[in-house]
Amino acid sequence: EPPTACREKQYLINSQCCSLCQPGQKLVSDCTEFTETECLPCSESEFLDTWNRETRCHQHKYCDPNLGLQVQQKGTSETDTICTCEEGLHCTSESCESCVPHRSCLPGFGVKQIATGVSDTICEPCPVGFFSNVSSAFEKCRPWTSCETKDLVVQQAGTNKTDVVCGPQDRQR
């Protein structure tokens, strides 16, 4: 009786269970009653990352420098090339097909997590007691100056965008 299902790493064709091609190889010829599946290695610029019956290997991803991309990991016959973004840029999507500049955190916000090649800057509002008066992709919220430790008093309260202003204490006459 011809099989209706095949083992793992096999496929059914013409009532025959044929071996799939291993990762890094493409199908040249299905198995027959007389022959085993024939597979060939992918060429240098190509890959297949699964057991397969593909007659064409996939082209390695091209990390286009015009889009701000650079190679993070060179592709092999079994893996695709991994692109990342040049410094100061990050990927627009998980597949990293293009890059955009990291965003800066506006005054009143500080950097919670510095951007990487694959993720944008994460900003957070400066909580009470902290401020940021610059637009920056690196600076965290800074704590207000402690006037007391300088033997000074607060002359102007701080905000999330400004530091406190300290001044001398009023002297008793």
């Epitope: 013409n14 025959q16 040249v28 027959t32 009653e33 007389f34």
Partner: antibody, heavy 115, light 112 residues
Framework: QVQLVQSGAEVKKPGASVKLSCKAS????????IYWVKQAPGQGLEWIGG????????NFNEKFKSRATLTVDTSISTAYMELSRLRSEDTAVYYC????????WGQGTTLTVSS | DVVMTQSPLSLPVTLGQPASISCRSS???????????LHWYQQRPGQSPNHLIY???NRFSGVPDRFSGSGSGTDFTLKISRVEAEDVGVYFC?????????FGGGTKVEIK
């Protein structure tokens, strides 16, 4: 239905060349190898080699490798075998065959090599 | 090359009686994938060969069930349970495990 139709009988002189054809129909030509087999008069069979029409890849019996050339023309679903530097021992019936989901044979081409 | 030896060379049989042909290979025909690529076919006078059995024991579609194949490794047998007049011809074994593919010399089945 699957059919392999071979070219007609040939008579050649020693040292000449001959090109036999095998026209396939009834299936997707590039999906299956075409093989060639020799049967000399009153003899058994000898495997010459095969060609994959998908990419032109060949495999050969070393005995025939230096004198046999296998080619295909996918536009007309035809396989060819050219045999060069013919000698009297090449006198035989030559079959083309295809397997995968059944085995199919051409009707054979008779080649006579004689001075 | 793998040498395929068939016996007998000639087999005179009585209609309705069984017949058996042996085929031995000079090395094992067990492929690394677990299959054994030993095949049998028949050639009637003046005709192209016609495959009967593939991979030792699998009958091709349309082949009568009076034909059966068995064996493993290097020893193989084709049996005809009850010979009919249309079974007359030469029977070949062949192997496609090793390149070059090779054939047995043939066994001529004729009616007594």
């Amino acid at each position: 239905q699957v059919q392999l139709v071979q070219s007609g009988a040939e008579v050649k002189k020693p040292g000449a060349s001959v090109k036999l054809s095998c026209k396939a129909s009834g299936y997707t030509f590039i999906s299956y190898y075409i093989y060639w087999v020799k049967q000399a008069p009153g003899q058994g069979l000898e495997w010459i080699g095969g060609i994959n029409p998908r990419n032109g890849g060949t495999n050969f019996n070393e005995k025939f490798k230096s004198r046999a050339t296998l080619t295909v023309d996918t536009s007309i679903s035809t396989a060819y075998m050219e045999l060069s530097r013919l000698r009297s021992e090449d006198t035989a019936v030559y079959y083309c065959t295809r397997h995968g989901n059944g085995v199919y044979w051409g009707q054979g081409t008779t080649l006579t090599v004689s001075s | 090359d793998v040498v395929m030896t068939q016996s007998p060379l000639s087999l005179p049989v009585t209609l309705g009686q069984p017949a058996s042909i042996s085929c031995r290979s000079s090395q094992s025909l067990l492929h690394s994938n677990g299959n054994t690529y030993l095949h049998w076919y028949q050639q009637r006078p003046g005709q192209s060969p016609n495959h009967l059995i593939y991979q030792v024991s699998n009958r091709f579609s349309g082949v009568p069930d009076r034909f059966s194949g068995s064996g493993s490794g290097t020893d193989f047998t084709l049996k005809i349970s009850r010979v009919e007049a249309e079974d007359v011809g030469v029977y070949f074994c062949s192997q496609t495990t090793h390149v070059p593919w090779t054939f047995g010399g043939g066994t001529k089945v004729e009616i007594k």
